[in-house]
Interface confidence: low
Amino acid sequence: ITRQSLDPQRRAAPQQKRSSPIEGLCPPGHHISEDSRECISCKYGQDYSTHWNDFLFCLRCTKCDSGEVEVNSCTTTRNTVCQCEEGTFREEDSPEICRKCRTGCPRGMVKVKDCTPWSDIECVHKES
C-alpha cells in the first residue's frame, strides 16, 4: 500500500467547512488551521482523519496497489481499505505486498484451510 507524501503547505479550499477547535482539538474528518483557531474539513476521497486531532493537515487517502482491490473507499473519517486479490494474501511479516497463495500441499499433507486475502492455505500432516 502506498501513501503519497503529504504537502504541509496544502491549504484548504475556500468552500471547505470550518468550525472551532474544542480544547485545541478538531473532530474526525477535520484538521486544525495553521493558527489553531479553526477546524477545516478534510477533502472527501482525497484525505481523512479518524480521531480528534490537532494535525495541520488531514492524512492522504491510501491508493490501492495493483494486485489489490478496494474494499471500502476513502471518506473524510476513514482511510481506504485495500485487500489482496483472489489467490493472493498479505503476510503479517511483510504487509506491503500481496503474496501468491500456494496451489497445493506438500506430499504427505492435506489442506485444512483455503487461501484468504489474509492467509495462505493451511496444510497439516496426514494421520498415519
Epitope: R3, S5, P21, G24, I32, D35, S36, R37, L56
Partner: antibody, heavy 121, light 118 residues
Framework: EVQLVESGGGLVKPGGSLRLSCAAS????????MHWVRQAPGKGLEWVAG????????YYADSVKGRFTISRDNAKNSLYLQMNSLRAEDTAVYYC??????????????WGQGTLVTVSS | QPVLHQPPAMSSALGTTIRLTCTLR?????????VYWYQQRPGHPPRFLLR?????????GPQVPPRFSGSKDVARNRGYLSISELQPEDEAMYYC???????????FGSGTQLTVLS
C-alpha cells in the same frame, strides 16, 4: 531501556556529503515518529527533519530542504540523515530524537548523545 | 520577530522556586497550544521535561520529578515552567517549544540559561 545511538559524523569539506545513522533499541521502533535536531556550537536547538512511523511522510526545515534526506529502515531499527551540498553553517551536533507518537509532534521524549558534523575547508 | 521568546538568562538561589517564561508572538493564541519544555545540562543532550495544555491535559517526561511543573497565562500569551526547591543539578539551559501537538515542523525558543546561586 530506550537507547538512541548516532554515528557517521566527522569533518567534511563544503559541498561534500555525509550520512548520519541512528541505531534505536529498547522500544518498538516501527511505531514511533523520529526526528533529527541539531545544535551549532554555543547555539540553541534547531529542528532539522522528521519522519513518521512508516517512513511515508517526511518533513524538513527550510534551511535544509532539497539538500538533506531523512529515511528509516524499520527492519534494522535505524534512522538516517543523508546530507548533501554541506555548508559551513551546517556545522553542529546532530541529535536523533524519538517522537512520543506515531506521527510527528513537539513531544520528543528520548534523545541520543549526538554526533558532531564539522563542515570546513 | 521570533515566534517564541525566552529571556536569555535567569538566576535564583538554591532551594527557592523560579518560573521561566516562554512568550508566544501575539499573532498566535496560546489558549489553543500546548507548551513543551526541554532541559539541557552542559555537555548533555536535551531532555524532555513536560507538556502543558491545561490542568486536565498535561504530561510529565520520563523520570521528571514533580518539582517541575507547567502553566499558561492566556491573557499574556505566555507559557511557564516552574521549578521548586532548586538544586545545583537544575543549572542548565531550558528550551520551550509550542504548538498543536501534531504540528509538522518544529520551532524551539532560543533558550534560557538558568544559574543556581549557592
Amino acid at each position: 531501556e530506550v537507547q538512541l545511538v548516532e554515528s557517521g559524523g566527522g569533518l567534511v569539506k563544503p559541498g561534500g556529503s555525509l550520512r548520519l545513522s541512528c541505531a534505536a533499541s529498547g522500544f518498538t521502533f516501527s511505531t514511533y515518529g523520529m526526528h533529527w535536531v541539531r545544535q551549532a556550537p554555543g547555539k540553541g536547538l534547531e529542528w532539522v527533519a522528521g519522519i513518521n512511523y512508516s517512513g511515508n511522510n517526511k518533513y524538513y526545515a527550510d534551511s535544509v530542504k532539497g539538500r538533506f534526506t531523512i529515511s528509516r529502515d524499520n527492519a534494522k531499527n535505524s534512522l538516517y540523515l543523508q546530507m548533501n551540498s554541506l555548508r559551513a553553517e551546517d556545522t553542529a551536533v546532530y541529535y536523533c530524537a524519538r517522537d512520543h507518537s506515531t506521527w510527528l509532534s513537539r513531544h520528543l521524549d528520548y534523545w541520543g548523545q549526538g554526533t558532531l558534523v564539522t563542515v570546513s575547508s | 520577530q521570533p515566534v517564541l521568546h525566552q529571556p536569555p538568562a535567569m538566576s535564583s538561589a538554591l532551594g527557592t522556586t523560579i518560573r521561566l517564561t516562554c512568550t508566544l508572538r501575539n499573532d498566535h493564541d496560546i489558549g489553543v497550544y500546548s507548551v513543551y519544555w526541554y532541559q539541557q545540562r552542559p555537555g548533555h543532550p536535551p531532555r524532555f521535561l513536560l507538556r502543558y495544555f491545561s490542568q486536565s491535559d498535561k504530561s510529565q517526561g520520563p523520570q521528571v520529578p514533580p518539582r517541575f511543573s507547567g502553566s499558561k497565562d492566556v491573557a499574556r500569551n505566555r507559557g511557564y515552567l516552574s521549578i521548586s526547591e532548586l538544586q545545583p543539578e537544575d543549572e542548565a539551559m531550558y528550551y520551550c517549544a509550542m504548538g498543536a501537538r501534531s504540528s509538522v515542523t518544529h520551532v524551539f525558543g532560543s533558550g534560557t540559561q538558568l544559574t543556581v546561586l549557592s
